[in-house]
């Protein structure tokens, strides 16, 4: 998987009145990272994790760089016109990716009140506009503004992406990021399904990076595909992320299956417990 | 390359017990079961049991249930299966196998010869 | 136990002869769970077709095989010398895992 930094900046309107404040968050290959604390006018770290990132440096640049984002977003609302009485919100979402052959890409999106109306490719310098008659006047609305701007050309967004991309280089450099490594917790739960059914399902949490290999398998060769359920990969709030994988066995064939799981060049094997729950730790 | 090396052909006295070995190379070893295979002297082939090198959990035909032993010893890669009480029906060419996790005995030893004979 | 019943015992065919080796199962089985193997005089079993129809890797073009249920069956488009072995089929559907009692082939 790439490298990723995403940027997450809202910015809130009240009858048609710019807000002062603005929210923002910063993701890290897809955990939370940073956030914009607005008490103490600060860029915070989210959690240890983000804190060994950057060691004892200070968060001054990313300070900066979020104030000013947000200044930004603040007078890109300003100029929507449509704005009706009420909460109305902008959201900015600016992703910049390192790909494994070292390849870039770069993209910004905007939303208002929730619904995506512009997305830009820095690359390609390409925007799109979803269909619907409000997001057309709406990125009309922004792209004009955004013109007039002069800061806001061609250039400023390839130095928005080149910056974004510095940043994430450096931290990248912190062997925190790169070299980090979660191992699973793994434990294998069952419950009745029907009769002469049970559902095993096996769950993997607290790991890091996103990559897993979580399967079940029967007498040791992994079940197809359409006989298994598979949950997508979360993040856990921790820094880490979690998933699950579940499959429908017959009652009394219970040592037949494991679940087999395989993390950063380790793996290991968990056998369906007979009782009702049975939690496994995975011990490397 | 994935490799499975049994051990050489044994000649043991009826009563007594043997152990054969497979010596598991090119892959990771705790990473995919060990089945065990018995074929007669011109006859078809047994499923004996089988074991995660991971675990050391087993399962087995029951009709190898007190006869055959299936242990692992990780540090070296090897699977075992002790045999006991042997009788000269249990003369047969013995095979370990594993899997690609996505077939059962995808790897073949070469076989061990037990000959069981006074 | 899942008996599996193999037909013709022997037999014996002339190189480019298309040959037909049937598996049947005394009880219905996934077609996930029915494997082929190929055992060469003096040699150990080579695992041949897996998963009823999926051949395994090095195997030749001109084998295939189909099935399902109780019925399965394994083609050999065109008999070569070196396709002289015994074939066996092999349930891994129940414990214990089954083997059919072989197809001795033989050239002409």
């Known amino acids: 998987e790439p490298h990723s930094l995403r940027y997450n900046l809202t910015v809130l309107s009240w009858d048609g009145s710019v807000q002062s404040g603005f929210l923002a968050e910063v993701h890290l290959d897809g955990q939370p990272f940073l956030r914009y604390d607005r008490q103490k006018c600060r860029a915070k770290p989210q959690g240890q994790w983000a804190e060994d990132v950057l060691g004892n440096k200070t968060w001054d640049r990313e300070t900066r760089d979020l104030t000013g984002n947000g200044k930004d977003l603040r007078m890109t609302l300003a100029h929507i016109k449509d704005q009706k009485e009420g909460l109305h919100s902008l959201q900015e979402i600016r992703v910049c990716e390192i790909h494994e052959d070292n390849s870039t890409r770069s993209s910004q999106h905007f939303y208002y009140d929730g619904e995506l109306f512009l997305s830009q490719n820095v690359e390609t310098e390409e925007w799109t506009v979803p269909q619907s008659s409000r997001a057309q006047t709406l990125a009309m609305n922004v792209r004009n503004f955004l013109k007039e701007d002069a800061m806001k050309t061609k250039t400023h967004y390839h130095a928005m992406h080149a910056d974004c991309l510095q940043e994430l280089r450096r931290y990248l450099e912190s062997s925190v990021v790169l070299r980090r490594r979660v191992p699973p917790m793994v434990n294998v739960t069952r419950s009745e399904a029907s009769e002469g059914n049970i559902t095993v399902t096996c769950r993997a949490s607290s790991f890091y990076p996103r990559n897993i290999t979580l399967t079940w398998r029967q007498d040791g060769v992994s079940l197809s595909h359409d006989t298994q359920q598979w949950g997508d990969v979360l993040p856990d709030g921790n820094g880490t992320y979690q998933t699950w994988v579940a499959t429908r066995i017959c009652q009394g064939e219970e040592q037949r299956f494991t679940c087999y799981m395989e993390h950063s060049g380790n793996h290991s094997t968990h056998p369906v417990p007979s009782g009702k729950v049975l939690v496994l730790q995975s011990h490397w | 390359q994935v490799q499975l090396k049994q051990s050489g052909p044994e000649l043991v006295k009826p009563g007594a017990s043997v152990k054969v070995s497979c010596k598991a190379s090119?892959?990771?070893?705790?990473?995919?079961?060990i089945y065990w295979v018995k074929q007669s002297h011109g006859k078809s082939l047994e499923w004996i049991g089988y074991i995660d090198p991971y675990n050391g959990g087993t399962v087995q035909n029951q009709k190898f249930k007190g006869k055959a032993t299936l242990t692992v010893d990780k540090s070296s890669s090897t699977a075992y299966m002790h045999l006991n009480s042997l009788t000269s029906e249990d003369s047969a060419v013995y095979y370990c196998?594993?899997?690609?996790?996505?077939?059962?005995?995808?790897?073949w030893g070469q076989g061990t010869l037990v000959t069981v004979s006074s | 136990d899942i008996v599996l019943t193999q037909s013709p015992t022997t037999m014996a065919a002339s190189p480019g002869e298309k040959i037909t080796i049937t598996c049947s199962a005394s009880s219905s089985i996934s077609s996930n769970y029915l494997h082929w193997y190929q055992q060469k005089p003096g040699f150990s079993p080579k695992l041949l077709i897996y998963?009823?129809?999926n051949l395994a890797s090095g195997v030749p073009a001109r084998f295939s095989g189909s099935g399902s249920g109780t019925s399965y069956s394994l083609t050999i488009g065109t008999m070569e010398a070196e396709d002289v072995a015994t074939y066996y089929c092999q349930q891994g559907s129940s414990i214990p895992f089954t083997f059919g009692s072989g197809t001795k082939l033989e050239i002409k």
């Open positions: 998963r009823t129809s």
């Open positions: 090119g892959y990771a070893f705790t990473k995919y079961n």
């Open positions: 196998a594993t899997t690609d996790g996505y077939s059962l005995f995808t790897y």
